[in-house]
């Protein structure tokens, strides 16, 4: 889609956005009993030259950015990424109609970076 | 700069991509006395729905890519980001001239993912 | 060996687009991106954008966004640049150039001659 | 934006005398990704000189650059007839490329 951001430059740096997913929206409620949504939260944002601290970036990230200035038509920006992700236990009907809980690992974004 | 992909339907799916930086044309050829470079690669691509296999994505991805598929213009794609970095030795010159062999960690991509 | 090679010359009425292309031969189309420059008279050389014609990748000067679209076809292995509500200011000849990961422009179309009178 | 300045505007010499051409840069260019480019009338500019000092290919060793940071340098020893010509400078360490304004070296 053309839905990228067209100026980078006015884009905020790597960070963590809040979202609430509510199951319903993504058409699970018949199957998930509980909870009814949860904060999942997104990263976005620039992973500009210089990298801060903030930016919890890998050495690898460091070195692609620096590819990136002198090469930007054949090596991206490093992404904003999740760095720390929660899991999440959820009450749900299998496929035979039992209720099961389960943990479900990596659905929360806890903080991001540039990766 | 404007340099987001215009058409990412033309756009591969998220993946490695080779990629070789040699120290001097980072700059940093007077401090890094060996290797001369190495094999950084880099990760590139689309993370659209449906997410395969093969993006080894983690749960928030796949909730990220529906939540972005209803809703374009607030929530992005997950970003291509590696999955996999090892580490590489370098010998280089401390800031009082002694000779020193580090392992840096984080410095190649051997895998990427949808994040 | 290399060869990039321009359509001819325009003549356009202000206000009026153009759609310059360039037909790369003789090395892996998709590889390479490919620059578009151009000069006025009498101007210094001047960056208008480019494109990376493996992934449609694009990027352009501020000075051109909104009126510049860089694009590409890789069956004719050929590039476009088309610039659109032209003015007087942008008579000159607009080149297209490729450079290879870390270096310079290496080779160059031979120019297109872009007039804009009314 | 890195503005690069070239000096002198026009170099009237004889064939076989030698040319030193500047190109001064508003900010220090990194890893000496700098370049120098001759353009003939109604030509397109053929690359000479990348890294600031290494010639490209088939370009004759008559042609040196030299210079880091800011201050670069383009010296042609003997010139040939071939040689008169305008001579670009450029840095490409990233985006926006720039270009100096050329200086114009002709037959005095």
């Known amino acids: 889609s053309a839905s990228d951001y067209n100026s980078s430059e006015l884009k905020t740096a790597c960070r963590k956005h809040e979202l609430y997913v509510s199951f319903q929206d993504l058409g699970w409620q018949d199957w998930i009993i509980a909870p009814k949504g949860y904060a999942a939260n997104y990263c976005d944002g620039e992973c500009s030259f210089p990298l801060n601290a903030h930016m919890n970036a890998t050495n690898h990230a460091i070195v692609q950015t620096l590819v990136h200035l002198m090469n930007p038509e054949y090596v991206p920006k490093p992404c904003c990424a999740p760095t720390k992700l929660n899991a999440i236990s959820v009450l749900y009907f299998d496929d035979n109609s039992n209720v099961i809980l389960k943990k479900y690992r990596n659905m929360v974004v806890r903080a991001c970076g540039c990766h | 700069s404007a340099s987001d992909y215009n058409s990412s339907e033309l756009k591969t799916a998220c993946r490695k991509h080779e990629l070789y930086v040699s120290f001097q044309d980072l700059g940093w050829q007077d401090w890094i006395i060996a290797p001369k470079g190495y094999a950084a690669n880099y990760c590139d691509g689309e993370c659209s729905f449906p997410l395969n296999a093969h993006m080894n994505a983690t749960n928030h991805a796949i909730v990220q890519t529906l939540v972005h598929l209803m809703n374009p213009e607030y929530v992005p794609k997950p970003c291509c980001a590696p999955t996999k970095l090892n580490a590489i030795s370098v010998l280089y010159f401390d800031d009082n001239s002694n000779v020193i062999l580090k392992k840096y960690r984080n410095m190649v991509v051997r895998a990427c993912g949808c994040h | 060996q290399v060869h990039l090679v321009q359509s001819g010359a325009e003549v356009k009425n202000p206000g009026a687009s153009v759609k310059v292309s360039c037909k790369a031969s003789g090395y892996t189309f998709t590889t390479f991106a490919i620059h578009w420059l151009r000069q006025a008279p009498g101007q210094r050389l001047e960056w208008m954008g480019w494109i990376n014609p493996g992934n449609v990748k694009t990027d352009y000067s501020q000075k051109f966004q909104g009126r510049v679209t860089i694009s590409r076809d890789t069956s004719a292995t050929t590039a476009y640049m088309e610039l659109s509500s032209l003015r007087s200011e942008d008579t000159a000849v607009y080149y297209c150039a490729r450079r290879q990961l870390w270096l310079p422009f290496d080779y160059w179309g031979q120019g297109t001659l872009v007039t804009v009178s009314s | 934006e890195i503005v690069l300045t070239q000096s002198p505007g026009t170099l009237s010499l004889s064939p076989g005398e030698g040319a030193t051409l500047s190109c001064r840069a508003s900010q220090s260019i990194s890893n000496n990704f700098l370049a120098w480019y001759q353009q003939k009338p109604g030509q397109a500019p053929r690359l000479l000189i990348f890294g600031a000092s290494s010639r490209a290919t088939a370009i004759p060793d008559r042609f040196v650059g030299s210079g880091s940071g800011t201050d670069f340098t383009l010296t042609i020893t003997g010139l040939e007839p071939e040689d008169f010509a305008v001579y670009h400078c450029?840095?490409?360490?990233?985006?926006?490329?720039?270009f100096g304004q050329g200086t114009k070296v002709e037959i005095k």
């Open positions: 450029q840095h490409y360490g990233g985006s926006p490329w720039t």
